[in-house]
Amino acid sequence: KSSNEATNITPKHNMKAFLDELKAENIKKFLYNFTQIPHLAGTEQNFQLAKQIQSQWKEFGLDSVELAHYDVLLSYPNKTHPNYISIINEDGNEIFNTSLFEPPPPGYENVSDIVPPFSAFSPQGMPEGDLVYVNYARTEDFFKLERDMKINCSGKIVIARYGKVFRGNKVKNAQLAGAKGVILYSDPADYFAPGVKSYPDGWNLPGGGVQRGNILNLNGAGDPLTPGYPANEYAYRRGIAEAVGLPSIPVHPIGYYDAQKLLEKMGGSAPPDSSWRGSLKVPYNVGPGFTGNFSTQKVKMHIHSTNEVTRIYNVIGTLRGAVEPDRYVILGGHRDSWVFGGIDPQSGAAVVHEIVRSFGTLKKEGWRPRRTILFASWDAEEFGLLGSTEWAEENSRLLQERGVAYINADSSIEGNYTLRVDCTPLMYSLVHNLTKELKSPDEGFEGKSLYESWTKKSPSPEFSGMPRISKLGSGNDFEVFFQRLGIASGRARYTKNWETNKFSGYPLYHSVYETYELVEKFYDPMFKYHLTVAQVRGGMVFELANSIVLPFDCRDYAVVLRKYADKIYSISMKHPQEMKTYSVSFDSLFSAVKNFTEIASKFSERLQDFDKSNPIVLRMMNDQLMFLERAFIDPLGLPDRPFYRHVIYAPSSHNKYAGESFPGIYDALFDIESKVDPSKAWGEVKRQIYVAAFTVQAAAETLSEVA
């Protein structure tokens, strides 16, 4: 069958029919439905929502919808023994205690099962000691403290402000510095945008608001007790002492009212520079300990949370492909939330729901996609991407042979300024072409394309007239598909103006105030930005599942590989003497990139010319495109990070949220001047250049003519 015969209508008409069926009003209705009660992973409420989504997806017309369950390690506060932090006097009396819960938002005062703020997977403990303020607790912040200021965090409780990097990296850094506890807080400098009121009168964080979140360092492992394998009924589980990524010191989050009470008494060293000062009326002294009058007072943490193996549920929906049912395009986003999930994740889940409904409507009219589309509602994302990772571990053999693409669908909005896209270079042209066909929802861009408003508001730093597209990092459910399995992946959402809003994420992230009303009143009253995100995500899935030739352009990978090679070479060239001494050469990498560029160019020419009516040749060319991303996977993984196997991209070792290019070489070069054995360190740089060069060359050869 030709594609058109199989799919009943002309491809262009199908795409238009699909997009026209997406309705803002439906997304609004779904968001409301998904946000009335908390849906914490492992709870009965979230199981019920899974069954509701399963039922509705069936009604919408999917061929099958199944629940996939796993028993994974989760973490909860002790209901009868709350977590808090105290200031204690010399007699051990608690003279100040941090809050036990957030003041509930209006209309939600009688909602039960709101989990109080906590740092998921914190060990239990009641450490007490002097406080040290460590800014954002980034690698560079600890360098400043330890190397420049000669401040020792060993045996201290550190207090760090949220923002800039993933909280798990902060905790890891504090542990390595010898701290015995970590307090995380939201500073108004990062979570209170000037000129905007606090919730419920605006979208800013009130003083009693607190960001929840996990503090794991899983490095892609999934369930901490079953790394590499699904947490199924017959799983062998590690003991807790051997679990992957658990923190070893107590950690707890607080809001800025409580932070004020802890920071206002700080003594010791003054902040090293203005970048260490937030917006509270406190000196931001680094410590250690409190100032003169209060020097005998200490800080004490009381953490009683427990880790428990708990059942979680993914919802997996299938829309079978008419021509290539063994090729999978996946749209997935999580369902579990910390509390109401007004933005994270339900603004994304509502969009997925409407995309499923639109695809179902087309299917009921006799249409099918060329390739199979899988829809996923993941569980336990907030606890370390557990649902998606366990499912991918269980289905890894199918996915590595059949996975065409994965499109992520967490929060649809983190602002309402412009589009934000992170994806594999293979999808650049798909995203460009699609956004040129979509209408911009932005004020002042009526009648203009989304591409135009996006490019104007978020221009590419390298190519004029093009929009910025970022590297994939992690911190979301695409991780296992991209970083471990090498399946081409992408994500899209509406974002804030990064130039004028310097706060990290959005102010109410992971707080009780992330409600339906937050979205409906302040972010997107008409749900036009949600609709646009639905069109982008849905449009990408449609094209990936339905275009005769996969909409991947391998030449764009060639361009970025050259850029990344130049960048890593320039980092290495900061050490010209050592490069000479240890005979470090990037020639092999640049040669491989050159070969890749030439072969990709020739492949693209063949792609234009081949006989698309020949199903064998079509399948062969498509397979070369599908398997290109896979070719960047090193089966041995990155050093000490076996589940990060992509040689071109990995989550930064210093910030899980950020993507790093040529991560093996980057990490080998990082802080190399401080290594005790320079010969060994530069030897590892050389080995990583070798691995990268080999991988790029091997990937290039997958695009060569097959015989």
Partner: nanobody, 123 residues
């Protein structure tokens, strides 16, 4: 409408105990710090005690420390003041007052007051 209603006052002998209640209506008590304030006959207002919205912190005037206990039951939208070892100088009209800032960790300005309940300590 938004209001606070105190109850539990009366005449009591020195050294005895009394428990005052303050029922809130028209607003969610759970979000606000609450205070007890008193006014002795012919005197100005004196702050007595404060409890944070979640009950995690309680602060007392030196004059009542160790004798009075402020508490709350958010599910009943009610504030309490347990007064033990009462003295003649505790004679006053006792008012409950709502803190104006949601989630405040220390006493701030008050924006809603009750009508007060009279406590007389006399032998």
């Amino acid at each position: 409408q938004v209001q606070l209603v105190e109850s539990g006052g009366g005449v009591v002998q020195p050294g005895r105990s009394l428990r005052l209640s303050c029922a809130a209506s028209g607003f969610p008590l759970i979000s606000y710090g609450m205070n007890w304030v008193r006014q002795a006959p012919g005197k100005g207002l004196e702050w007595v005690a404060f409890i944070t919205y979640d009950g995690s912190n309680r602060y007392y005037a030196d004059s009542v420390k160790g004798r009075f206990t402020i508490s709350r039951d958010n599910s009943k939208n009610t504030l309490y003041l347990q007064m033990n070892s009462l003295r003649a100088e505790d004679t006053a009209v006792y008012y409950c007052a709502k803190d104006r800032i949601v989630g405040a960790r220390v006493p701030d300005a008050y924006d809603i007051w009750g009508q007060g309940t009279m406590v007389t300590v006399s032998s």
